[in-house]
Each structure stands twice: as C-alpha cells, then as structure tokens.
C-alpha cells in the first residue's frame, strides 16, 4: 500500500489504478476510517457520503476537505479494459501545522547557580501533537533533570481535536557575565516538514549578589500589644529566588517551619521578647534582620521600650 499525508481541510484525490478513465467502469471503493466501524463500500451513484468521499467520473476518490476522522485505509478494486482486476491501497494520515510557537512569560535576566525559569514555549493547533524542543545558542538543549529541566503539557481541543503544547524551561546557569540565547522549535515529525522556530530571546546572566536588604515589619506598629491580641511579624527580603526564613526569639531559634511570616495569636506575657528573622540564601550565608521587641501591656499606652522598633514599624539592615 501507499502512505499518503494530507493537510487537514485540504482536498485529497486518490486514484483507482487500472480503472478506465471514463464510464463504463467496474470499480469499488471502500474505506475504513474514523467515520466507519468496519469497511464502508461507497455507492458509485453517490449519496450521503459524497460530502466526505466522492467517486469522480474518472474513478478517482475525492475527499473534499480531509479531517482527523478521515485517517485510515482506502481501497479500490477495479477491472481494467483487459478484464484484469487491479487493486489500490492507501493509508491516509492527516496533519495540521500549528501557528508559529511563542515564548510566553520570558525571564528578564537569569541568576547564576540557582534555578531560573527561562519561559514557556506554546504551540497551538497541531495535529498530530508533535514536539517542542529548546535550543541554547542554536544547539539542542537536552533536559538532564538537574541543570536543565523541562516541564511539558499537552492538551487536545474537545471539538477540533487539535493539540496545544506547552513546554516550560528551567535552567541553572553555571556562571555570570554571559548572554545566552534561547529559542524553541515545534516539529510535527513528518518528512519534508521543517521545524517552526520562535523568535530567540537573549538573557543576561548575573552573579547572585547578596540580598539588597532584609526588613522586619511588625504589626501593630511599635510592637506593643494588649494581652490576647495578635502580632504579625513579616520578614521582607528582595532576593531571588526567595530564601528560606527562620525565626529567632531572644537569641534562640524558634522550632517552626521556614516561613517569611510569623503570626503570634492571643499573645500573653510569655510571648514578650526580642524577635529577628534569618534568611538563608543558596549562594550566601545566613543574613539576620535587625531585632524588634514585642511588649505585652494591659493599657497599651506606654511608649516604645528601649531597643524596640521605631515609629515606622520596621527595622532595616543596610
């Protein structure tokens, strides 16, 4: 048999070998596709199937607009002028080229030695699904699960049957000062079909610098609270990626899960003390915030105690 590849929506003509070009003809077309459950023999006189597969006067079979459901096998059996039976057998596959792939949500820059999301490559409207590949400086990027991580998702449209592919690339650049170029390409995996490429994105890789500053914000301002009240301590840090944050009270680590927010509900005198947060960055040592004092008072009208946070409610480490 012969393998035929047809573009979705385009017409396809399959010739019936051996069939006389004009009637009278002795021929039979049958098909086994997504529209049938077994073999369907087409009537030479035409009928309801003509909208999807029609026998032409010369004996060929016309598919006016091929669809996904037309994938399958088409066979013609004809008797030629000399009375010999000739068979034609076609295996039809269909395809649809998607729109040009795009890199959405691209990074503005990358930081060396830490995981960075480069962006998400999106291709819409393909059939069959095809594949997305990432390229670095023109060379194919092979995901290794460590320095190069690719997260893929394939969705099929419930009505059209066409595919949308998404591929998210995360990399750990080894050193700063470079300007790598990333691009993404879509391939259907069909012969003679060139891949579709995105516009490349060039990103600067910077060395991971120390966090610009660590701030400890306290609510209520001043750190003075009545018994039974709630205190919220927030450790604000500008580093990327966000570091792990641990908490210290009166010089001792608090046995809590890492979190940038510490909530003290229904405070009592046992919650009084000096609090600070410690941010641990992957490429740097731990960094501690200035301390804040928490005071629990009945009236709440006393001024800030010595060593407590000032009016702004923040302690800042330059």
């Amino acid at each position: 048999g012969q393998n035929i590849t047809a573009r979705i929506g385009e017409p396809l003509v399959l010739s019936c070998k051996g069939a006389p070009k004009k009637p009278p003809q002795q021929l039979e077309w049958k098909l086994n596709t997504g529209r049938t459950e077994a073999w369907k023999v087409l009537s030479p006189q035409g009928g309801p199937w003509d909208s999807v597969a029609r026998i032409l006067p010369n004996g060929s079979l016309l598919l006016p607009a091929t669809g996904i459901v037309d994938e399958g096998t088409f066979r013609c059996r004809a008797t030629n002028r000399r009375g010999k039976e000739v068979k034609s057998n076609y295996r039809v596959r269909v395809y649809q080229i998607p729109g040009k792939p795009e890199i959405v949500d691209p990074a503005s820059e990358l930081t060396a030695s830490v995981p960075n999301k480069v962006g998400t490559c999106v291709s819409e409207g393909s059939y069959p699904a095809g594949t997305l590949s990432w390229h670095l400086d023109g060379k194919l990027l092979i995901p290794d699960g460590k320095e190069t991580l690719v997260k893929e998702e394939t969705r099929r449209h419930p009505e059209t049957g066409l595919f949308t592919l998404r591929s998210e690339l995360t990399v750990i650049p080894t050193q700063g000062g470079t300007h790598p170029t990333f691009s993404c390409s879509f391939s259907l995996g069909l012969p003679r079909r060139r891949p579709l490429n995105t516009a490349p994105i060039q990103l600067r890789v910077r060395e991971p610098g120390p966090p610009e500053g660590i701030q400890l914000l306290v609510e209520p301002e001043g750190g003075i609270v009545a018994p039974g009240g709630t205190v919220t301590l927030t450790c604000a840090i500008s580093a990327q990626p966000p570091p792990q944050v641990h908490w210290i009270k009166d010089g001792a680590p608090l046995p809590l899960a890492p979190s940038p927010v510490l909530l003290l509900p229904e405070v009592g005198h046992e919650d009084e003390g000096t609090y600070s947060c410690v941010a641990t960055h992957p490429s740097h040592g731990p960094q501690e915030s200035p301390p804040v004092s928490i005071r629990v008072t009945e009236t709440g009208d006393e001024g800030p105690a010595e060593g407590s946070v000032g009016e702004s409610g923040l302690g800042t480490l330059a």
Partner: antibody
C-alpha cells in the same frame, strides 16, 4: 436563530407544475447540504431530494427522478424545488431541511408548505 | 434500498412510564441514524443524532442506543408533552429512508 421558511405551495392540477422556495437564515447557507422531505396527509415522512453545498450534485429517489429538480442560490440563501408532471400522489406537506449528508443527517426543519394536486 | 422497520407503530402509555421504540435497518448503516419527534400540524424536531447523541435543547429523558443494525429511542419517564409521533431516519445511503413512525398516545 437558524430558520427555514418554505413558500410556493398551493393547489395544482395533475400534470401541472409548481416551484417551492425555502428561505434560510441564521447560518452560513453555503456550508450545508439541503434537503426536501414530504409528508402525505396522515402518512409518514418521505425523502424527496438533496443537494450538496455547492449545488453541483443533486440526489433523488426513483419516485420523483426526472420530474422534480432541486436547486439553490447561495447568494440569496435560498433553496428551490421545481416540480413538474405532478400527480395526485405528490399531494403532501413539503418540508425544507438542513443537511442530508453523513456529517449531519437532517437537523433543522422549516414549518412546511402544502401542495395539493387535484382536478 | 435500505428498509427501516420501526416498531411498534403505536403505543399507549401513562405519564412517568418508560417508553422504548425500535428501528431495525435491513443492512449496516453504521451510526448514521437520527430520531425525530413530530406533533400534529408541526414540523419534525430532531432528538437524537448519529444514533446516540442528544441534540441541543432536548431533555435528558430522551436517549438513543444502537446494537448492530437495531436502533432504540428510549424515553425514561414520559411527560405530557411527549405524546407525539416518533420517526427514525437512516442517512448512510440514498435513498434516505425514514421508519414508518410510532404514535405515542395517552393510556
């Protein structure tokens, strides 16, 4: 809203002619096959004719072949049935319906127009 | 030509009853069968397309099934507005062929 409205029915003598029309609206007319179906008084439904979306191919049962002609004007969103050599047994309500091929069957029908063949 | 033998030709039923109507094709017609409802003086209304699919706006008490060349329309709980005549149609081959109809009457 998808709508089909038939017109042109009436009383005609045996051997006479009549032309039915069907005005379509609410859908892209030239994307669909169209079909005429009839129903004799107190009887069941009978297929009369179908035409493909371009108008190039027409289909009839033996009972009306060579007497009836289905046609369409895609620019006017209109379907027609030219009926010649009418017989008493052609008396029926004639319905225009969208479809007629395997992608659809028949999905939307007009309200029908009555054709009476009698002397 | 394909024959569509519809049974029964009529039936009497009460509101709330489960009603089953069958069409048997004289040869394989695949899934290419529609079911219609027709009320007196009105045009047919499509209920089921391609043997088993419920048409838009049709109540879910209507369903279609197929076993080989046997096609069934089921009304799970008959409602007062369901008293009408029902037809099947095969559209796999020309001539397009309708079943003879089933009149559903109030018992």
């Amino acid at each position: 809203e998808v709508q089909l409205v038939e017109s042109g029915g009436g009383l005609v003598q045996p051997g006479g002619s009549l032309r039915l029309s069907c005005a379509a609206s609410g859908f892209t007319f030239n994307n669909y096959w169209m079909t005429w179906v009839r129903q004799a008084p107190g009887k069941g439904l009978e297929w009369v004719a179908s035409i493909d979306n371009s108008g190039d191919n027409t289909y009839y049962p033996d009972s009306v072949k060579d007497r009836f002609t289905i046609s369409r004007d895609n620019a006017k969103n209109s379907l027609y049935l030219q009926m010649n050599s009418l017989r008493a047994e052609d008396t029926a309500v004639y319905y225009c319906a969208r479809g007629g091929d395997i992608t659809l069957g028949l999905d939307v029908w007009g309200q029908g127009t009555l054709v009476t063949v009698s002397s | 030509d394909i024959q569509m033998t519809q049974s029964p030709s009529s039936l009497s039923a009460s509101v709330g009853d489960r009603v089953t109507i069958t069409c048997r094709a004289s040869q394989d017609v695949g899934i290419y069968v529609n079911w219609f409802q027709q009320k007196p003086g009105k045009a047919p209304r499509r209920l089921i397309y391609r043997a088993t699919n419920l048409a838009d706006g049709v109540p879910s008490r209507f369903s279609g099934s197929r076993s080989g060349t046997d096609f069934t329309l089921t009304i799970s709980s008959l409602q007062p507005e369901d008293f009408a005549t029902y037809y099947c149609l095969e559209f796999d081959e020309h001539p397009l062929t309708f079943g003879g109809g089933t009149k559903v009457e109030i018992k």
